[in-house]
C-alpha cells in the first residue's frame, strides 16, 4: 500500500500568510505574488546576481514535529540561467543551500545561523534560459530531501542564497505513515514510518470480526518501511466456521449454507438429507432418520443404516454350510457396508437353542465381512442351525434397530472322515482318520469298508471305536479301495472319499510307512 503523507508545512497552500523571516532583513529573499498556469501564486524569490558574497537567508516559521521521526522536504523552485545576466557570471550562482535546526521552543525573530545544520546543496535539473523566460516557459524543478531521526519538539528549515536568481514556489514538509490497512483479513493500524532507512517496524495485525488465526498458523504481522510502504506480510487470518470471506470481511454463511472450520474456502450448500441451516451455520443438521458418523465430513450428505442383505442362501455340504447373500437394496447412501454373521444351534429332541460361535469354524472372521459369502464348518450332525447375516454401515451404531436376514439349515450327517494311509506291508494296510472334535461325541463306531480294486462282487467290513485300523490278510502288490464312515445313534454319517491304497510287492517287503 502507498505511504500516507502527513503534511507539517505547506507554503504554497498558505497563500503568503506564513510570514517567514528573511536575513538580512529587507534584503535578499522577497515574498511576491505571480501568475503561473493561469493561477496566482506566492513565492519567495531572490535575484542578487551581480553582487558577490551573497549570504541571504530565508527561515520558515517554527514547525511542530508531533509524532514525526523522519521528515521529507519537497521543494518546487525555478532557477534562471546565469548567462541571462551579462557581467554577472563571476558572482552569479545556480544553486542554493537547504538547512534545518531542531528546537524545543520557537525563537521568534531571533535568527542564529550557527544553530542550523546543512541538509544539502539544492541544484536544479533545469534552468530557465532567456528564451524560456521570454516565452513565459518557466522550468519548474522538484527536489526532495529527508532528515531524521528528529528528537526535539519542533524545527525550522532555512534556505541560504549565495547569489542565484531563484524563486521558491513550494515548500512542503511532511512525514510518512503506513496507512491503515486490511490485508489477509487482518487490520493493521496507521503506523508512523521509522526514521532509519534499513529498519522496518514490525506491526502486529488484529483479525477482523469473525476471523481467527488458523491453528498452528502465524499471527498476522506486517513491516512498515521508512517510505510509508507496508512490506513483508507474515501470517494471516481466516474466516471462522460459519463465515466466509467477502472482500476484506468475514460474512455469515447464508441460510442453507454452512462452513464447518476456519479456512479459505467459501460456505458450502447444505448437503442432501439435511435440514435448511440458519445464517452463520457451522454444519447442517440431518433430516429425521438420517445420521452423520463421527468421522464423516460436514460436507457429506447425511446417511442412514442399510436395509437387510437382499437374498441369503445356506447350502449344506455334510457338516459344512456355505452362506451366500446379495448386498442390501438400500445402502443408506454409504459405501462402508460390512456384514456380521451369527449362528444359533437347536437340538431337535429338546428344542433347546443357544449360540454356537464357540463350536463352529468360519472361513474368515464373521464380523466386519466385506465379501458376500462365508463357509461355516465343524457343524454337529443332526442339529438345526440358524444363521443371521446383518448389514451395517458407519451410522448403524447410531440406531437401535438392526438390518438382518436369517437362514436355517439342518445337519443330518457327520462330516466325512479324513482318511490317510499310515503304513503298509505286502499283506497289510494301516489306515487312520479324523472328524471334527464337536462331532466325535455323537459317533458310536466307525465302519471301514475295503475291497480289491476291480472286484465288485465282494467287500470286507471292519468296525472300530478308535481312529485307526490295520487291515490284514491282504494280497501283496494289490490295490485296495478303502472308505470310512461314522456310525451314530441316528444312523450312518457321511462316508469318506474312496481311497486307493496299494500293498507292497514281495521284493519291497518290510512295514514301510507312506
Amino acid at each position: 500500500a502507498q505511504g500516507k503523507e502527513v503534511v507539517l508545512l505547506d507554503f504554497a497552500a498558505a497563500g503568503g500568510e506564513l510570514g517567514w523571516l528573511t536575513h538580512p532583513y529587507g534584503k535578499g529573499w522577497d515574498l511576491m505574488q505571480n501568475i503561473m498556469n493561469d493561477m496566482p501564486i506566492y513565492m519567495y524569490s531572490v535575484c542578487n546576481v551581480m553582487s558577490g558574497d551573497q549570504d541571504n537567508w530565508l527561515r520558515t516559521n517554527w514547525v511542530y514535529r508531533g509524532e514525526a521521526e523522519r521528515i521529507f522536504i519537497e521543494l518546487k523552485f525555478t532557477v534562471r540561467d546565469c548567462n541571462s545576466f551579462p557581467g554577472g557570471a563571476s558572482s552569479c550562482k545556480e544553486t542554493f543551500n537547504l538547512y534545518y535546526a531542531e528546537s524545543d521552543l520557537d525563537y521568534g525573530t531571533n535568527f542564529q545561523k550557527r544553530l542550523f545544520t546543512k541538509i544539502d546543496t539544492i541544484a536544479p535539473d533545469e534552468i530557465t534560459v532567456s528564451s524560456d523566460f521570454e516565452a513565459r516557459h518557466v522550468k519548474l524543478n522538484v527536489e526532495e530531501r529527508s532528515v531524521g531521526p528528529l528528537t526535539r519538539k519542533g524545527f525550522y528549515l532555512a534556505f541560504q542564497d549565495i547569489g542565484a536568481c531563484v524563486a521558491l514556489l513550494s515548500v512542503r514538509v511532511y512525514y510518512k505513515k503506513c496507512p491503515e490497512l486490511l490485508q489477509g483479513l487482518a487490520h493493521f493500524p496507521e503506523t508512523i514510518a521509522g526514521s532509519d532507512a534499513p529498519s522496518l517496524a514490525t506491526v502486529a495485525g488484529t483479525c477482523v470480526d469473525h476471523a481467527v488465526v488458523p491453528p498452528g498458523g502465524e499471527e498476522p504481522r506486517m513491516h512498515c518501511a521508512v517510505d510509508g510502504e507496508w512490506l513483508v506480510p507474515i501470517g494471516q487470518c481466516l474466516c471462522q466456521a460459519g463465515y466466509e470471506k467477502v472482500e476484506d470481511a468475514c460474512q455469515a454463511c447464508s441460510p442453507g449454507f454452512f462452513k464447518f472450520e476456519a479456512s479459505e474456502s467459501p460456505c458450502l450448500e447444505c448437503p442432501e438429507h439435511t435440514l435448511p441451516s440458519p445464517e452463520g451455520a457451522t454444519s447442517c443438521e440431518c433430516e429425521e432418520g438420517f445420521f452423520r458418523a463421527p468421522q464423516d465430513p460436514a460436507s457429506m450428505p447425511c446417511t442412514r443404516p442399510p436395509s437387510a442383505p437382499h437374498y441369503l442362501t445356506a447350502v449344506g455340504m455334510g457338516a459344512k454350510v456355505e452362506l451366500r447373500w446379495t448386498p442390501p437394496q438400500d445402502s443408506g447412501g454409504r459405501e462402508d457396508i460390512v456384514y456380521s454373521v451369527t449362528c444359533e444351534q437347536c437340538w431337535p429332541e429338546s428344542g433347546e437353542c443357544g449360540p454356537c460361535e464357540a463350536s463352529v469354524r468360519y472361513s474368515e472372521p464373521p464380523h466386519g465381512l466385506t465379501r458376500t459369502s462365508v463357509t461355516v464348518s465343524d457343524l454337529e450332525p443332526h442339529m438345526n442351525y440358524t444363521f443371521t447375516v446383518e448389514a451395517r454401515n458407519g451410522v448403524s451404531g447410531l440406531v437401535t434397530s438392526r438390518s438382518f436376514r436369517t437362514a436355517s439349515v439342518s445337519i443330518n450327517q457327520t462330516e466325512p472322515p479324513k482318511v490317510r494311509l499310515e503304513g503298509r506291508s505286502t499283506t497289510s494296510l494301516s489306515v487312520s482318520w479324523s472328524i471334527p472334535p464337536p462331532q466325535q461325541s455323537r459317533v458310536w463306531k466307525y465302519e471301514v469298508t475295503y475291497r480289491k480294486k476291480g472286484d465288485s462282487n465282494s467287500y470286507n467290513v471292519r468296525r472300530t471305536e478308535g481312529f485307526s485300523v490295520t487291515l490284514d490278510d491282504l494280497a501283496p502288490d494289490t490295490t485296495y479301495l478303502v472308505q470310512v464312515q461314522a456310525l451314530t445313534q441316528e444312523g450312518q454319517g457321511a462316508g469318506s472319499k474312496v481311497h486307493e491304497f496299494q500293498t507292497l510287492s514281495p521284493e519291497g517287503s518290510g512295514n514301510l510307512a507312506v
Epitope: I35, P40, V49, S84, F85, E134, C165
Partner: antibody, heavy 122, light 107 residues
C-alpha cells in the same frame, strides 16, 4: 527605496535625436526586464519598447521601430532609449518602468519613474 | 494588434459608491491583463495583475475579474483619494496595448 529616475528629455527639432537615461536604485537591476512607456499631453498611455535582462532581447512599437533603440548597462544599473528621426507626434512624457517579476516574464509594470518630457517642435 | 476598449471613458460617483470599469479585448488574452491608477502629474501605479491578483500594498477595495474577453475593475467603496484615471493593459502579446482610460471623479 526602490526607485527609477529618468533624465535626458528636452526640446528637440523634428528629425533630431535625444538619448534618455533611467537610473535604477534600491533593487538588483540586472534580472529585470525594463520598458519605456510614453504619454502624449492629455492622452493615454502608449508602450514604446522593452528589453530583456541580458539586453539581447528587445521589442518595439511599430510607431518607433527603426528610429528608437533600447539598451541597458547592467554594471551601471541604467536603461537607455536612443531616439533618432524624432517627429512631432513623439512629443510626450517618457516613463521608464520595471517588469514586476524576475521569475516569469511579466509585462505588468510595478515600478515607474516620474517621467521626462520630450518636446519635438520647430 | 490587440485592441483594448475601455468603458466608460469617465464616471462621476459619490463617496462610498461602488464603481465598475470594464475593458474588452479584441481577442483572447488569457489572464494577462493589468490595471493601473494614474493621478494628474504622477506616474501610473500598478493595482492588479493577472486580471485579478492584487499587487502588494494595494488596498482590498480594488478587485479585478474576468469573463471571457471582458475584464472588470471594481472599487467597492469610492473614497476621495480614488479620484484618478484608470487604465487597463494587456501583456499577452506584442505590441503591449493600453485601454483609452476611464476618468473617475467624485461628485
Amino acid at each position: 527605496e526602490v526607485q527609477l529616475l529618468e533624465s535626458g528629455g528636452g526640446l528637440v527639432q523634428p528629425g533630431g535625436s535625444l538619448r534618455l537615461s533611467c537610473a535604477a536604485s534600491g533593487f538588483t537591476f540586472s534580472p529585470y526586464d525594463m520598458l519605456w512607456v510614453r504619454q502624449a499631453p492629455g492622452k493615454g498611455l502608449e508602450w514604446v519598447s522593452r528589453i530583456g535582462s541580458s539586453g539581447g532581447y528587445t521589442k518595439y512599437a511599430d510607431s518607433v521601430k527603426g528610429r528608437f533603440t533600447i539598451s541597458r548597462d547592467n554594471s551601471k544599473n541604467t536603461l537607455y532609449l536612443q531616439m533618432n528621426s524624432l517627429r512631432a507626434e513623439d512629443t510626450a512624457v517618457y516613463y521608464c518602468a520595471r517588469a514586476r517579476s524576475v521569475v516569469v516574464s511579466s509585462d505588468a509594470f510595478d515600478i515607474w519613474g516620474q517621467g521626462t518630457m520630450v518636446t519635438v517642435s520647430s | 494588434d490587440i485592441q483594448m476598449t475601455q468603458s466608460p471613458s469617465s464616471v462621476s460617483a459619490s463617496v462610498g459608491d461602488r464603481v465598475t470599469i470594464t475593458c474588452r479585448a479584441s481577442q483572447g488574452i488569457s489572464k494577462w491583463l493589468a490595471w493601473y491608477q494614474q493621478k494628474p502629474g504622477k506616474a501610473p501605479k500598478l493595482l492588479i495583475f493577472g486580471a485579478s491578483t492584487l499587487q502588494s500594498g494595494v488596498p482590498s477595495k480594488f478587485s479585478g475579474s474576468k469573463s471571457g474577453t471582458d475584464f472588470t475593475l471594481t472599487i467597492s467603496s469610492l473614497q476621495p483619494e480614488d479620484s484618478a484615471t484608470y487604465y487597463c493593459q494587456q501583456y499577452n502579446d506584442y505590441p503591449l496595448t493600453f485601454g483609452g482610460g476611464t476618468k473617475v471623479e467624485i461628485k
